[in-house]
């Protein structure tokens, strides 16, 4: 069985944090000056 | 309240293949986050391996991809960390984490694995 | 792959002092579809798992005291400790939780003057 939790942004279980960072495929690599 | 727990063997040869499990309570591991591996070498900073997102998807270090497999056991919460062909520059404290949209909110406590003969 | 540079690697400074920690990234941080900087904060104590302090490069995480501060956009972010205290010193890392693979940096170990 699935626990619930008391989280700092008193969410729910059926939203979903999909815990993935952006990644845009259109980000460039640019050396910083 | 969310807590990981790492577990698994502290000593492995070289060669091997390393084991560890994170249980976490407090929170499904199917509901949401990635749920990551990262480590850390002694006296050094903090290296990223992995991660097994809540729809079971993996993602792994390109630098480790080779040699890194994370699994999940849904029926116990737990996931699981095999990084294969140890030398000793794997020697590390293993910690497991969670991984919100934008960053590590909850910690494993870390375990220490040293690889020698 | 970002890289993370964090300075100095080593600060020595005394109680109710301000204390600035400097990252820099490789690449730009910040999300054109969100105008969020990905840019985490976590701070370490000896033999302890890293503790998140601030996330999208200014956002304190819950509990951490008002002191801690994070500001910058792009690639040049701060971390600023307005008055410290016995139990800030500790490492501190940045993090670029941007674009895979996730990437640190080095470390600033803050230390007792």
């Known amino acids: 069985s699935e626990t619930t939790t008391g989280t700092s942004s008193n969410s729910s279980q059926s939203t979903s944090n999909s815990g993935l960072a952006p990644n845009p495929t259109n980000a460039t690599t640019k050396a910083a000056g | 309240q969310v807590q990981l727990q790492e577990s698994g063997p502290g000593l492995v040869k070289p060669s091997q293949t390393l084991s560890l499990t994170c249980t976490v309570t407090g929170y499904s591991i199917t509901s949401g986050y990635t749920w990551s591996w990262i480590r850390q070498p002694p006296g050094k900073g903090l290296e990223w391996i992995g991660y097994i997102q809540y729809t079971g998807s993996t993602r792994y270090n390109p630098s480790l991809k080779s040699r890194v497999t994370i699994s999940r056991d849904t029926s116990k919460n737990q996931f699981s960390l095999k990084l294969s062909s140890v030398t000793a520059a794997d020697t590390a404290v293993y910690y497991c984490?969670?991984?919100?949209?934008?960053?590590?909110?909850?910690w494993g406590q870390g375990t220490t694995v040293t690889v020698s003969s | 792959d970002i890289q993370m540079t964090q300075s100095p690697s080593s600060l020595s400074a005394s109680v109710g002092d301000r204390v600035t920690i400097t990252c820099r990234s490789s690449?730009?941080?910040?999300?054109?579809?969100?105008?969020?900087?990905?840019l985490t904060w976590y701070q370490q104590k000896p033999g302890k798992a890293p503790k998140l302090l601030i996330s999208?490069?200014?956002t304190r995480a819950s509990g951490v005291p008002s002191r801690f501060s994070g500001s910058g956009s792009g690639t040049d972010f701060t971390l600023t400790i307005s008055s410290l205290q016995p139990e800030d010193f500790a490492t501190y890392y940045c993090?670029?939780?941007?674009?895979?693979?996730?990437?640190f940096g080095g470390g600033t170990k803050l230390e007792i003057k």
């Open positions: 999208w490069a200014s």
């Open positions: 690449q730009s941080l910040l999300y054109s579809s969100d105008q969020k900087n990905y």
């Open positions: 984490a969670r991984g919100t949209t934008a960053s590590f909110d909850y």
């Open positions: 993090q670029q939780y941007f674009i895979y693979p996730l990437t």
